[in-house]
């Protein structure tokens, strides 16, 4: 029961996390730009991985895509790649984990196969979460190091005026969504890996006991009957002697000990 719950919870947490990663990747508010001394009018800029938007005090909003690849910083391209890889891995992980869920029966799929699939999806979720966290962190670092407080001196032609303007870049909502979503996906992946351990079949030694009624006429029987645990077949044909109980040693059984929980 605990294994099923851990697996199910891991799946749900990862699902929420991957939905968050997709949302963060599509969001426009990765960074915002404010002018300290805006000399013209109230205009608010914010940027995402794919386009830049402007919102005016009147409520008018307009977005423009980055139609050039060459003019974009390599860091931005790297962030895009990390987020896409995270989404792809997460989506594949979700697909695999659906079939791995213990509560879903698909044909005669054994627990060992489900355990392997659970582990695979768990690892995929972990990598997906790490990709998202890395992508968001790289972007945040890019803002802090390159753009955070850029004081620009503008020269316009020969003898033109010089105006110093401070542009403040702040973290947008998408960064926080990405960090949380990446963390959730990571946690979900860890939970799946933990659930995998519970699903994996363990080699357990069962001591099966055969009982025989004592009697004066009981003779030695070469290759007497086999004791069985009901879990598996006895591979060793043991000789059973008269005079009471004898143990069947090392009968191997492969199903999970949680099968009947």
């Amino acid at each position: 029961m605990a294994v099923t719950a851990c697996q199910g919870l891991g799946f749900v947490v990862s699902l929420i996390g991957i939905a968050g990663i997709i949302a963060a990747t599509c969001m426009d508010q990765w960074s915002t730009q404010d002018l300290y001394n805006n000399p013209v009018t109230a205009v608010f800029n914010y940027q995402g991985l794919w386009r830049s938007c402007v919102r005016e005090s009147s409520g008018f909003t307009e977005c423009r895509g980055y139609f050039t690849l060459l003019g974009l910083p390599a860091m931005l391209q790297a962030v895009r790649a990390l987020m896409i890889v995270g989404i792809v891995l997460g989506a594949i992980g979700l697909l695999v984990s659906i079939f791995a869920l213990k509560c879903i029966r698909i044909g005669s799929m054994e627990d060992s196969a489900k355990a392997n699939m659970t582990l695979t999806s768990g690892i995929m979720f972990i990598v997906s979460g790490l990709c998202a966290i890395a992508g968001v962190s790289v972007f945040a670092n890019m803002l802090v190091t390159n753009f955070w407080m850029s004081t620009a001196n503008m020269y316009t032609g020969m003898g033109g005026m010089v105006q110093t303007v401070q542009t403040r870049y702040t973290f947008g909502a998408a960064l926080f969504v990405g960090w949380v979503a990446g963390g959730l996906t990571l946690i979900g992946g860890v939970m799946m890996c933990i659930a995998c351990r519970g699903l994996a079949p363990e080699e357990t030694n069962y001591k099966a006991v055969s009982y025989h009624a004592s009697g004066h006429s009981v003779a030695y029987k070469p290759g007497g009957f086999k004791a069985s645990t009901g879990f598996g077949s006895n591979t060793k044909n043991k000789k059973i002697y008269d005079g009471g109980a004898r143990t069947e040693d090392e009968v191997q059984s492969y199903p999970s000990k949680h099968d009947y929980v």
């Epitope: 002018l35 000399p39 013209v40 205009v43 830049s52 402007v54 003019g71 910083p73 503008m154 105006q163």
Partner: nanobody, 122 residues
């Protein structure tokens, strides 16, 4: 590099009209807003009029309301200031101002033109 090219200044009689224009060129991603400031000798620079390029919201100084009209041409990245009923106190150097997003992954900067002289005198 971004350039702002102003034109249309000159000498005009009181009550007359002038039309200033300012064209922005260079590696412009988009224009947030453009406007006009003026600086009379011995005085501080003041806002005359400004316009946002997306929604076209305008902002005027009280002293020019009803006389001056600001407009923009998005396709040409140009802003115009139509000045009517000019007064001697409108005499100043008029500077174009542009709040722009520049570059592939755009950075927001404010640029100023070199200024154009407007003289209102009889």
């Amino acid at each position: 590099q971004v350039q702002l090219v102003e034109s249309g200044g000159g000498l005009v009689q009181p009550g007359g009209s002038l039309r200033l224009s300012c064209a922005a060129s260079g590696s412009i991603f988009s224009i947030n807003a453009m406007g006009w400031y003026r600086q009379a000798p011995g005085k501080q620079r003041e806002l005359v009029a400004a316009i946002t390029f997306g929604g076209g919201s305008t902002n005027y100084a009280d002293s020019v309301k009803g006389r001056f009209t600001i407009s923009r041409d998005n396709a040409k990245n140009t802003v115009y200031l139509q000045m009517n009923s000019l007064k001697p106190e409108d005499t100043a150097v008029y500077y174009c101002n542009a709040d722009l997003l520049v570059g592939g992954f755009p950075r927001r900067n404010v640029y100023w033109g070199q200024g154009t002289q407007v003289t209102v005198s009889s």
